[in-house]
């Protein structure tokens, strides 16, 4: 290889070892009968060298730096050439660096020909391996503007006081043009301006200078977005941090055409504007940081440009003014990410502040609209707390657990509506009474309704899930000892039609010691499947649960267990089951950690099944599934 650099070209070439690889044989640059690992070539020099291996691209990289001095003479503006030409360089991963130094009062503009640039974040790489790293200068400090790939929206970057542009090309890449030109501009009076041009629908993710490190103190950075007038743009902040300000306030400012309040100032934690028509600017303004504990200001955001949606002009009123302790979140439902462009899906408050998720709280009336091509991409999750602090006031008080109609009228599917039911410890318990009797979901008899109630303990330290219940069964009521959460979870859009079947009343009742009591009134000819809470994880240790099973006068109940043994192994205490006839009080007691489970038994009168757990050894849990079947009495045994 021969590299000759013209005199006065201000070019330096450096060939050096790249990232070390676990290649068995080292490779060297061979020059003047020497094996070296770094070679520097300066302006005016002509160097001949070879490599000691067949694939030097696996070992070495080449850096070509051109210093452009705009301080002492005219600046060579215009299209930037790749010098020396890539065809004259060894086929190594190469980085062309242009270091332009200019006066503070001079603005420099990098103009990128099509394809424009797409900014990438830390840890990301470009599909074709071609990256553009751009940095500026504040006095002697280098500021990283960002790293960019091809095929994006960034068309121009304006800076002042100097710019360093590094173009990294993989050894196999045929590119032989820089793809950008430099122009001079008047002072921009800020760190930089990045212009992002959208031709049609698309998105751009952009970051503050130095991201993920801190944005320079008290600096200003502007993004100018060029958006066709018929499209709408929405801004969402993906990630941000605020520094500790001594003076001034960190903020973002929008210049939105047609707005009467330009510039519109937002805090970084605010919901950002959405549904904007046409071009707009966004500026990030830093503050004077606390010298002792500065913290860092950083921002990563996304601009989504898409056609206005039909829904974007409809306003929905969500009236939560009469609600208490309730929050409603509209958010994207989890989906597999596709690689192609997907239009954004936003929910907007007052038609302006749009984001991919929105939480509405009780006590207010909210006006929302949607900027979304397909509302099935969103769902709603609601949480409401009903708590009793004074047991004398609450006792026997009832509340209806019903989804408010305002929420049902929204064009977004309800996913979960959770009621957190809180009672004073050891003073009150709860009873859930459904409008329609409930069926417990089991593998043997799964629920096939459009919604279910998920009942679980709401005590943080307690891992107790009573089960999933849907309308159309035999469970008349569920009594629970203490705090629980009841979640209405929908499984199909048809919930809107079946909404009338929902309805659960909770009442505060005198305290009882058992963890839960299920009242079961089986229907004739249907098999009722029941299982212990925390199925698959095992009934928590020392927990007791009961089933109160009603048997009509003219029927016989067959109680069947689906295992021969319970499988529980006790570390301490005993696990037992009591089956007690309610009329005679006659009871059978089974040791679950020793005995075999009873064979199918017939009960002519209502009876109790009570299961109490020991402290089991791990992996040997107590899970029981049983069924109750009613059949008509053939002989009157009374």
């Amino acid at each position: 290889f021969e590299i000759a650099l013209p005199r006065e070209s201000n070019i330096t070439v450096l060939i050096k070892l790249g990232t070390p690889t676990l290649l068995a044989k080292p490779c060297y640059i061979v020059i003047s009968k020497r094996h070296i690992t770094m070679l520097s070539i300066k302006s005016g020099e002509r160097i001949v060298f070879t490599f000691s291996c067949q694939s030097p691209e696996n070992h070495f990289v080449i850096e070509i730096q051109k210093n452009i001095d705009c301080m002492s003479g005219p600046c060579p503006f215009g299209e930037v050439q790749l010098q020396p030409s890539t065809s004259l360089l060894p086929t190594l991963n190469r980085t062309f660096i242009w270091d332009v130094k200019a006066h503070k009062s001079i603005g420099l503009e990098l103009q990128f020909s099509i394809p424009r640039l797409r900014q990438i974040g830390p840890g990301e790489s470009c599909p074709d391996g071609v990256t553009h790293s751009i940095s500026g200068r504040i006095d002697a400090t280098v500021v990283r503007i960002g790293t960019f790939c091809s095929n994006g929206t960034v068309s121009r970057i304006k800076m002042q006081e100097g710019v360093k542009m590094a173009l990294h090309l993989p050894w196999f890449h045929p590119r032989n043009v820089s793809g950008f030109s430099i122009a001079n501009r008047s002072s921009i009076k800020r760190l930089c301006i990045i212009e992002s041009v959208f031709e049609g629908e698309g998105s751009a993710t952009l970051m503050s200078a130095n991201y993920p490190e801190g944005f320079p103190e008290d600096e200003l950075m502007t993004w100018q977005f060029v958006v066709p007038a018929h499209l709408r743009a929405s801004v969402s902040f993906l990630n941000f941090n605020l520094s500790n300000c001594e003076r001034k306030e960190e903020r973002v400012e929008y210049y939105i055409p047609g707005s009467t309040t330009n510039p519109e100032v937002f805090k970084l934690e605010d919901k950002q504007p959405g549904n904007m028509a046409g071009n707009f600017n966004l500026s990030l303004q830093g503050c004077d940081q606390d010298a002792q504990s500065p913290g860092i200001l950083r921002l990563q955001f996304q601009v989504l440009v898409q056609h206005p949606q039909n829904e974007s002009n409809k306003i929905y009123v969500v009236d939560l003014s009469n609600e208490r302790a309730m929050s409603l979140t509209i958010e994207p439902r989890p989906v597999k990410q596709s690689r192609k462009f997907v239009p954004g899906c936003f929910v907007c408050l007052e038609s302006r502040t749009c984001s991919s998720n929105l939480t509405l709280t009780s006590g207010s009336k909210h006006k929302i609209s949607f900027l979304c091509d397909d509302l099935t991409r969103l769902w709603m999750n609601v949480e409401k707390t009903i708590s009793c602090t004074d047991h004398r006031y609450c006792q026997r008080k009832s509340y209806s657990l019903q989804v408010p109609s305002d929420i049902l009228h929204l064009p977004v599917e309800l996913h979960d509506f959770s009621w957190k039911l809180l009672v004073p410890k050891d003073r009150l318990s709860l009873v859930l009474v459904p409008a329609q009797k409930l069926q417990q979901h089991t593998h043997e008899k799964p629920c096939n309704t459009s919604f279910s109630y998920l009942v679980a303990s709401a005590i943080p330290s307690q891992d107790l899930y009573f089960g999933s219940f849907c309308p159309g069964g035999s469970i008349k009521q569920i009594q629970v000892k203490q705090n629980i959460s009841v979640t209405l979870r929908t499984f199909a859009p048809s919930f809107q039609q079946e909404a009338s079947r929902q309805g659960l009343t909770v009442s505060f009742i005198p305290y009882f010691k058992e963890e839960g009591v299920f009242t079961v009134t089986p229907d004739t000819k249907s098999k009722v499947y029941l299982r212990t809470p925390n199925w698959d994880r095992g009934l928590p240790s020392l927990t007791s649960v009961s089933w109160n099973i009603s048997v009509p006068r003219d029927q016989v109940a067959c109680l069947t267990f689906f295992k021969e043994r319970s499988g529980v192994v006790c570390q301490t205490g005993r696990a037992f089951m009591i089956i007690q006839e309610q009329r005679t009080r006659a009871e059978e007691i089974f040791s679950l950690d020793e005995d075999v489970l009873p064979k199918p038994s017939f009960h002519h009168h209502s009876f109790w099944v009570n299961i109490s757990n020991c402290s089991p050894t791990s992996g040997k849990q107590l899970d029981l599934l049983f069924s109750v079947t009613l059949t008509p009495r053939t002989v009157d045994l009374t």
Partner: antibody, heavy 121, light 112 residues
Amino acid sequence: EVKLVESGPGILQPSQTLSLTCSFSGFSLSTSGMGVSWIRQPSGKGLEWLAHIYWDDEKRYNPSLKSRLTISKDTSSNQVFLKITSVDTADTATYYCAREGSANWEAMDYWGQGTTVTVSS
Amino acid sequence: DIVMTQAALSLPVSLGDQASISCRSSQNIVYTNGITYLEWYLQKPGQSPKLLIYKVSNRFSGVPDRFSGSGSATDFTLKISRVEAEDLGVYYCFQSSHVPWTFGGGTKLEIK
């Protein structure tokens, strides 16, 4: 134009240290691949390579004389030096410096005119 | 050390004749990069040596094309197709593939 000029003491006595200087112009010893060699030639005899110094200060010596030789350079003043300690009459010779560079055929393409050194008591 | 042997101490030739000077190395002088660093120098009386051929067969700039070099591994030859008066002097082969770099003893080209 490339030019090399050797200079030395002319005459010196046995056991003394011989100091030679090669002053050059037309190239820079900071250029990668560039180097300067010292070669000597006793009168009426053949050539003997002594030492070589590279742009990055790496040095090569003839093992038969290594313990007595020291080659060095001053890049900024375009000079290369050779010191030979404990000289005796066998060191009487014409001493040449020559440049070698990677862009210059990796051979000694330019030589100085030589400086004659006589060791005699 | 690699010994470079020039068998003929002198080679008498007539002007206009072809001259062939041989040089043998005591071992292979191919460098690790596959290049053989074998050079030929001519020293005229009272002058410093001048480079004629580098890397076995490449003529240095300004050297007339009547000079050619050949050979490989351990055997090398310098040919002068038509000897001219200005070609007279001592020819040295030189290897710089392995340290110490070594010169041959020289072959004096003289008029018959």
